[in-house]
Interface confidence: low
């Protein structure tokens, strides 16, 4: 899938399996990353699991589990706040549009969480105090929290060198991160396709081409669209919002720049 | 060098301002101060010369003079929130407000600094 | 009152040493580290190291490493910075400061600094 | 060439707000909780304005503040008044190394 960092990089990750996104003393999320196509290097989320950890007297422990197809608006526990405590309703669920977008606010540690489902797979979403998110046991065990380290550099994809491949008249299959890149989708469609949601040429627009051209499935332009909206609500500072490429520091990394 | 971790389970640990705790607060205090200068003993070894391991077992010290609190008793245990910022807040760990971030964080300082994460597509 | 009272003036020639005091009052010295800092004249501030009266460890800037010895006597509360092989461009203004204790890292307390000139 | 990139200067009138910046890197600003910032005015030896990013001693006004996102540190002097016509200097503890920025000088017009 694709990441924004906290610290507004961009990268395009193809870690498969179950990876930490956050990790800190309030609260856990894993995603579970699955092939987009058989035999694809390119990954998209099929599982997101947040535990919202006990926490003095506003809320107990609360579980959070949505995967394809299944967008539940309560905890796995049936509730929708955060328990019997007397701050409760420091944690609330809200269901914004049943089955494909979900919203959890944790007043307590001042985060928002936006969960969808666009097509078959998930995107998140959070806003987090700085605070927060640097609040953790162990600084040393950090490594792979992906929202704040961003993905290891040998699960990156190579975004740049994959979209100059894309834009050569007649690119080698190879180039492309899955096996076949379907025939239905040439570059100047897709790029229209982009275009049409994301008039702006910014690494979500990219990365919304790039999807395209790796599955051939038009739901991702949605995905990319939704991405950049939870982002212009949730970012504090909207002159970053869109973040463009530069020239990488490191082979498969694409930095921001406002 | 672990004492950025001391640290942070020392913050941990004294919700009510390191520097100033409630006067009811002072034994919970003074255990928090030993639990903290255990945990810098235990990363001794491997912080020679780091400025921020010195200035804590300085401040250690001084905290525990000034707070009339012995060597020897009990010590804490961490508790989860590093929330709100150390200050001078007298503010109880059962106050509603300490369910609210955004509330209890301006009584100490500016606004909270928000950043933003998302994960999305393949 | 917290205070720092730093030596006065010296002018040195190229290749000498260069002593400079630091008397601190006011509170316990050995809770508290001491940075040292220099300015050179229409320059930035420029760390050049730090010691614990407590223990006597320091920490110096690398480039300075070789040159610089900072000492402590805390029977005078007195921090102490020596610079050696002196040369023209360590002409400056020499600060020293107080590091906040516990767990926090700060200089909140500043000595009112010593010129030094080094000067064939 | 200082290892926290600092704009040289700033200005703005009485009662405006103006925003110092000081960049480094991951180690330097990034994961660092001990960032400060001080205060001089010439001929003066530095006053100490903000420590742990955000964090005011007692005695400074409240009109400074201090923020950090990703690799950049930002003191903020909101309703600036005449006697904050000074040089600013950002500070960074990382590992063993104390580092300072190149200074800016803030004018009020």
């Known amino acids: 899938p694709h990441l924004r960092t906290f610290t507004d990089h961009f990268q395009t990750c193809k870690v498969q399996g179950a990876w930490p996104l956050i990790d800190n003393n309030y609260l856990n999320v894993q995603v579970t990353n699955t092939p987009v196509l058989p035999g694809s290097a390119a990954t998209a989320t099929s599982k997101l699991t947040i535990i919202f950890k006990n926490f003095q007297e506003c809320v107990d422990q609360k579980v959070y589990q949505a995967e394809m197809d299944e967008l539940p608006s309560a905890f796995a526990d049936g509730s929708k706040n955060g328990g019997d405590k007397h701050g409760a309703n420091s944690l609330k669920i809200t269901e914004k549009v049943s089955g494909q977008h979900v919203e959890i606010q944790a007043k307590y540690i001042g985060t928002t969480i936006v969960v969808r489902q666009v097509g078959r797979y998930l995107t998140f979403a959070v806003r987090m105090p700085e605070e927060v998110v640097n609040a953790v046991e162990d600084r040393d065990s950090q490594g792979l929290y992906l929202c704040l380290r961003g993905c290891p550099l040998n699960q990156q994809i190579d975004f740049q060198a994959f979209r100059a491949n894309a834009e050569s008249p007649r690119r080698p299959a190879a180039a492309s991160p899955s096996p076949v890149v379907p025939e239905t989708f040439p570059y100047e469609t897709a790029v229209a396709k982009c275009k049409e949601k994301l008039p702006v040429e910014d690494l979500y627009y990219q990365a919304c081409v790039f999807d395209l051209l790796t599955t051939g499935d038009v739901n991702f332009t949605l995905a990319a669209y939704y991405a950049l909206e939870d982002g212009k609500m949730l970012h504090s500072n909207k002159d970053k919002l869109h973040l463009f490429e530069r020239t990488r520091e490191l082979p498969g990394a694409v930095a921001a720049a406002a | 060098c672990k004492i950025l971790k001391c640290n942070s389970e020392f913050w941990s640990a004294t919700s009510s301002g390191s520097h100033a705790p409630a006067s009811d607060d002072v034994p919970e205090f003074c255990a928090a101060l030993r639990t903290y200068a255990l945990c810098t003993r235990r990363t001794a070894r491997t912080c020679r010369g780091d400025l921020a391991y010195h200035s804590a077992v300085h401040g250690i010290e001084d905290l525990m003079s000034q707070h009339n609190c012995s060597k020897d008793g009990p010590t804490s245990q961490p508790r989860v929130r590093t929330l709100p910022p150390a200050g001078d807040s007298q503010e109880r760990s059962d106050s509603p407000e300490i369910c609210h971030y955004e509330k209890s964080f301006h009584k100490h300082s500016a606004a909270p600094n928000y950043t933003h994460c998302g994960l999305f597509g393949d | 009152e917290v205070q720092l009272v730093q030596s006065g003036a010296e002018v040195k020639k190229p290749g000498a040493s260069v002593k400079v005091s630091c008397k601190a009052s006011g509170y316990t010295f050995t809770s508290h580290g001491i940075s040292w800092v220099r300015q050179a004249p229409g320059q930035g501030l420029d760390w050049m190291g730090w010691i614990s009266p407590y223990s006597g460890n320091t920490n110096y800037a690398q480039k300075l490493q070789g040159r610089v010895t900072m000492t402590t006597d805390t029977s005078t509360s007195t921090a102490y910075m020596e610079l050696s092989s002196l040369r023209s461009e360590d002409t400056a203004v020499y600060y020293c400061?107080?590091?906040?204790?516990?767990?926090?890292?700060?200089?909140?307390?500043w000595g009112q600094g010593t010129l030094v000139t080094v000067s064939s | 060439q200082s290892a926290l990139t600092q704009p040289r200067s700033v200005s703005g009138s009485p009662g405006q707000s103006v925003t110092i910046s000081c960049t480094g890197t991951?180690?330097?600003?990034?994961?660092?909780?001990?960032v400060s910032w001080y205060q001089q005015h010439p001929g003066k030896a530095p006053k100490l304005m903000l420590y742990?990013?955000?964090k005011r001693p007692s005695g400074v006004p409240d009109r400074f503040s201090g923020s950090k996102s990703g690799n950049t540190a930002s003191l903020t002097i909101s309703g600036l008044q005449a006697e904050d016509e000074a040089d600013y200097y950002c500070c960074s503890y990382a590992g063993t190394d104390t580092l300072f920025g190149g200074g800016t000088k803030v004018t009020v017009l």
């Open positions: 991951s180690s330097s600003v990034g994961d660092s909780i001990y």
């Open positions: 742990d990013v955000t």
């Open positions: 400061a107080r590091v906040g204790s516990g767990p926090y890292y700060y200089m909140d307390v």
